[in-house]
Interface confidence: low
């Protein structure tokens, strides 16, 4: 973009420039060119010896310009077209400038002016051209700067040429206001920062509802001395709730949202959300639906799962295998885990309580991903109720729970009560008892024994009676003895492990 400070041709002769010396040299004249009246300053003192004729412009306000461009259109006659070649004739003129903070009016002093250049024509107008009214127009441009004062004058020094100055245009260059990458760059004076830095770096302003991305570079462009924008750096992005439409950020339409500053468009509100208002940054979940903290806002809202399906409890002596299937309704999530809790009830008193501490699970029961678990170390003649709860990532956001229960009665025998009946140096006589009510269910008793400290081998004796003598034992040795009832359903409860010691060879029975 060019900002014109002075345009002689456009003023149609209304600019009264100062000539020096007064009444000699340069003169304003009107001519017809291409059927149009044109004004020009002309001088043609080619035979009068040395010339020093000055034409000074009016004072020109600099505005924001730091460097100005001066475009001259002129014509020069060929010195050879004058009688005798006019020995003092020249075919060039000089261009000067002077800066000032005030208009000096008619006070003209040559010493205040600095020479810009000698202006020479590319083409001169020879006699034949002149007679055919075919003048050769030359265009020359010069640049001046940096300027620092409020205004300036230009001056043209004639040193004996035949010249007509048809156009003097002074302008400076600006990079025009521009929208790029959602950033508005202001109209900027085209100025070289230095010889080594010919580009001015300009920061852009993000358009309404646009922001510089977090951790990103703000929008920058480079304004060249020629008034052209180059090398964009950084960008602005439409802020949350807004999307890019051409060079602007528009609020997300109702039913759409955008949760962060990004290049992406607004997204449609996901399933199970309420329709959003204009400019939404998120979509609220429908009643009964939720978002886990780690769920992206683009994900459908979900709900806790229903209870697990088809829970079964299969008793196996002192063990129970629990099996279930996944909930019918997963709540729209894949992150389902199961949690098993246990309650035991004494049939005689009807009293119940938790039993997590007394039973053993085949795997930790509070974040199960599989749909089965085995519970062991169950007590005999006890009623157990197991609850299996299904949970997902949003279960923690509601107070209700989704679980199914199954009950099982443990009918295995009570552990036998064992005592040492007799002993010798090589044998131990062991007896036991169980409640009479359970004796009919016992098929045999299994006695397991081994030397204390010997974990690698053990002996097993089976008997239908309530006693056994363990022979061939080592003297003065402690044995670990356990008795277990065997029923049709499998193994009953085992007694606690007892430590019994044979007599030493020197000792006597006690």
């Amino acid at each position: 973009k060019e900002v014109v400070l002075l345009d002689f041709a456009a003023m149609k002769g209304e600019l009264g420039w100062l000539t020096h010396p007064y009444g000699k040299g340069w003169d304003l004249m009107q001519n017809i060119m291409d059927d149009m009246p044109i004004y020009m300053y002309s001088v043609c003192n080619v035979v009068s010896g040395d010339q020093d004729n000055w034409l000074r412009t009016n004072w020109v306000y600099r505005e924001e310009a730091e460097r100005i461009f001066i475009e001259l259109k002129f014509t020069v006659r060929d010195c050879n077209s004058f009688p005798g070649g006019a020995s003092s004739c020249k075919e060039t003129f000089n261009l000067y400038y002077a800066e000032s903070d005030v208009d000096y009016g008619t006070n003209f002093q040559k010493r205040q002016f600095t020479k810009i250049d000698t202006i020479a024509p590319d083409e001169i107008t020879v006699s034949s051209d002149f007679e055919a009214r075919n003048v050769k127009l030359n265009v020359e441009e010069r640049m001046v700067g940096p300027l620092t004062r409020k205004g300036f004058y230009l001056a043209f020094q004639d040193i004996g040429a035949c010249v007509a100055l048809l156009s003097v245009r002074v302008y400076y260059k600006k990079c025009p206001e521009m929208l790029q990458s959602l950033a508005r760059f202001p109209e900027t004076i085209a100025v070289a920062v230095s010889d080594t830095q010919p580009l001015a770096t300009v920061a852009g302003t993000c358009v309404d509802h646009a922001v510089v991305p977090y951790g990103g570079e703000g929008p920058l462009m480079h304004c060249t001395v020629d008034g052209e924008w180059l090398v964009p750096i950084g960008q602005c992005l439409c802020q949350e709730g807004y999307e890019k439409v051409e060079d602007a950020c528009r609020a997300c339409s109702p039913g759409f949202f955008k949760s962060e500053a990004s290049e992406s468009p607004c997204l449609e509100c996901p399933e199970h959300t309420l329709p959003s208002t204009e400019g939404a940054t998120s979509c609220q979940c429908e009643e009964g639906y939720f978002r886990a903290p780690e769920d992206p806002l683009s994900m459908s809202c979900t709900r806790p799962p229903s209870a697990p399906n088809y829970l079964t409890a299969i008793g196996m002596g002192a063990k129970v295998e629990l099996r279930w299937t996944a909930p019918k309704d997963t709540g729209g999530r894949q992150d389902i885990v199961y949690s098993v809790t246990c309650e035991q009830c004494w049939p005689e008193s009807g009293e119940c309580g938790p039993c997590e501490a007394s039973v053993r699970y085949s795997e930790p029961p509070h974040a199960l991903t599989r749909t089965s678990v085995t519970v062991s170390d169950l007590e005999p003649h006890m009623n157990y109720t197991f609850a299996v709860e299904a949970r997902n990532g949003v279960s923690g956001l509601v107070t209700s729970r989704s679980f199914r229960t199954a009950s099982v009665s443990i009918n295995q025998t009570e552990p036998p009560k064992v005592r040492l009946e007799d002993r010798s140096t090589t044998s131990l006589s062991v007896t036991w008892s169980i409640p009479v009510s359970q004796q009919s269910r016992v098929w045999k008793y299994e006695v397991t024994y081994r030397k204390k400290g010997d974990a690698n081998s053990y002996n097993v004796r089976r008997t239908e009676g309530f006693s056994v003598t363990l022979d061939d034992l080592a003297p003065d040795t402690t044995y670990l003895v356990q008795v277990q009832a065997l029923t049709q359903e499998g193994q009953g409860a085992g007694s606690k492990v007892h430590e019994f010691q044979t007599l030493s060879t020197e000792g006597s029975a006690n």
């Epitope: 993000c206 509802h209 510089v212 929008p219 709730g241 400019g279």
Partner: antibody, heavy 126, light 112 residues
């Protein structure tokens, strides 16, 4: 006309609660960050809390942290300050004031609090 | 005790020039944070007077000017008028504080 109007002040006993409101008109409040600033009788200005345009960033002065909660409803062009566990030293005129959104060109935070409400008085006394 | 220090009071005769200083530290003004100035006329809400160290919002007379240097800022009022009698507060930001916003203690300007 751009204006902010506070309401909800009054007399409350120590330990009590109050909720202040600030209604914005004449501009789109969702484009601006907002502040609460208070002024105890005969004293200077004390900044209380800040909330960004989308409520994604919230700050509190140490003196109110854990007791006061700032929030906003952009659909209603409203700003709120929930004040719990009030103390005698919370007695003041409470002003809401808007921030112009910082952006890269203006530099952060080139603009101050350019629009203020008329204030609402909170008195904490037994 | 305010993070930014202002003189409690200044005074001047009509037509005179007065300045109000605002002294901070390396974690606020000295860290490059902008300084804003507010005017609070008696019985009214504060009003933004100077923003971004030296910029005047529209409607603020050019008798008011702001500047900043190092860890300090100052507000200058030339051609003092009776209606300038008010409390003046500087405000900046402090990287060491929660929320960052800090005010000076305020300066009472009396027009003699």
């Amino acid at each position: 006309e751009v204006q902010l109007v506070e309401s909800g002040g009054g007399l409350v006993q120590p330990g009590g609660s109050l909720r202040l409101s600030c209604a914005a008109s004449g501009f789109t409040s969702s484009s601006y960050s907002m502040n609460w600033v208070r002024q105890a009788p005969g004293k200077g200005l004390e900044w209380v809390s800040y909330i960004s345009s989308s409520s994604s960033t919230i700050y509190y002065a140490d003196s109110v942290k854990g007791r006061f909660t700032i929030s906003r409803d952009n659909a209603k062009n409203s700003l709120y300050l929930q004040m719990n566990s009030l103390r005698a030293e919370d007695t003041a005129v409470y002003y809401c004031a808007r921030y112009r959104l910082p952006n890269f060109w203006s530099g952060y935070p080139n603009y101050g609090m350019d629009v203020w409400g008329q204030g609402t008085t909170v008195t904490v006394s037994s | 005790q305010s993070v930014l220090t202002q003189p409690p009071s200044v005074s001047g005769a009509p037509g005179q020039r007065v300045t109000i200083s605002c002294t901070g530290s390396s974690s606020n003004i000295g860290a490059g944070y902008d300084v804003h100035w507010y005017q609070q006329l008696p019985g009214t809400a504060p009003k933004l007077l100077i923003y971004g160290n030296s910029n005047r919002p529209s409607g603020v007379p050019d008798r008011f000017s702001g500047s900043k240097s190092g860890t300090s800022a100052s507000l200058a009022i030339t051609g003092l008028q009776a209606e300038d009698e008010a409390d003046y507060y500087c405000q900046s930001y402090d990287s060491s504080l929660s929320g960052h916003v800090v005010f000076g203690g305020g300066t009472k300007l009396t027009v003699l």
